[in-house]
Amino acid sequence: MEDFNMESDSFEDFWKGEDLSNYSYSSTLPPFLLDAAPCEPESLEINK
């Protein structure tokens, strides 16, 4: 399973749309601040 790649400090809004985000990756925290904290990898249903 590939988990989320946190090597980059920049994130792009998933829902904004290409003409609005203009492919830019903003230097900001993930939308849910706890996402950046170390945790056990999630197990998604499609992997079971």
């Epitope: 590939e2 989320f4 790649n5 946190m6 090597e7 980059s8 920049s10 994130f11 792009e12 809004d13 998933f14 829902w15 904004k16 749309g17 290409e18 003409d19 609005l20 492919y23 990756y25 903003s26 900001t28 925290l29 993930p30 939308p31 849910f32 601040l33 706890l34 996402d35």
Partner: antibody, heavy 120, light 116 residues
Framework: QVQLVQSGAEVKKPGSSVKVSCKAS????????ISWVRQAPGQGPEWMGW????????NYAQKFQGRVTMTRDTSISTAYMELSRLRPDDTAVYYC?????????????WGQGTLVTVSS | QAVLTQPSSLSASPGASVSLTCTLR?????????IYWYQQKPGSPPQFLLR?????????GSGVPSRFSGSRDASANAGILLISGLRSEDEADYYC?????????FGGGTQLTVLG
């Protein structure tokens, strides 16, 4: 684990309004858009619009302009979607969703869905 | 004509590779769009699998196995979701989506049945 938790099922009369809530449980909403997507029985998803939790700015799908209002209360990490002048064909499961992408991966979050039934 | 057209159903055997297509309406060039792919199982919300525009502009969903991959067929003006090593748990509905004219547009979906 971060989750989007939605309010419970609603049964509404035609012509009335419904307000669905979406709370970020275990995390804090940031500047990324929260979209609302509905899915009628046996149909594909239909995007209704999004709200920026930081600014409160909205972008509504043309189909729902004038009938939908998206708001948020950052103090309780909750977004709301209100749909007015309900019709029977508004019967659907309503989802909130958010997410972000790095250069290599994307992470999406969806609420569990809220069934809204419009019936006389 | 719909913006995005998907075959309504598809069936294949475990272990096989399947290609799910998402054809863009004439006049809308697939090369200009990121094609998003979602998997949905009964009673659950859609789950993002991946998005694909080109080999240099593609993102996988977090935790989504690499046997789910994207491509495009320029001659058919279509986006493609390739699932290799098909498993029984891949049986689901699959939807494509694009950001078009300042709105998210979803295809009608393909119901994938895993035989046996």
């Amino acid at each position: 684990q971060v989750q989007l938790v939605q309010s419970g099922a609603e049964v509404k009369k035609p012509g009335s309004s419904v307000k669905v809530s979406c709370k970020a449980s275990g995390g804090t909403l940031s500047s990324y858009a929260i979209s609302w997507v509905r899915q009628a029985p046996g149909q594909g998803p239909e995007w209704m619009g999004w709200i920026n939790p930081n600014s409160g700015g909205t972008n509504y799908a043309q189909k729902f302009q004038g009938r939908v209002t998206m708001t948020r209360d950052t103090s309780i990490s909750t977004a709301y979607m209100e749909l007015s002048r309900l019709r029977p064909d508004d019967t659907a499961v309503y989802y909130c969703a958010s997410g972000y992408c790095s250069r290599f991966n994307c992470k999406d979050y969806w609420g569990q869905g809220t069934l809204v039934t419009v019936s006389s | 004509q719909a913006v995005l057209t998907q075959p309504s159903s598809l069936s294949a055997s475990p272990g096989a590779s399947v290609s799910l297509t998402c054809t863009l309406r004439s006049g809308i060039n697939v090369g200009a769009y990121r094609i998003y792919w979602y998997q949905q199982k009964p009673g659950s919300p859609p789950q993002f699998l991946l998005r694909y525009k080109s080999d240099s502009d593609k993102q996988q969903g977090s935790g989504v196995p690499s046997r789910f991959s994207g491509s495009r067929d320029a001659s058919a003006n279509a986006g493609i979701l390739l699932i290799s090593g098909l498993r029984s748990e891949d049986e689901a509905d699959y939807y494509c989506a694009i950001w078009h004219s300042s709105a998210w547009v979803f295809g009608g979906g393909t119901q994938l049945t895993v035989l046996g």
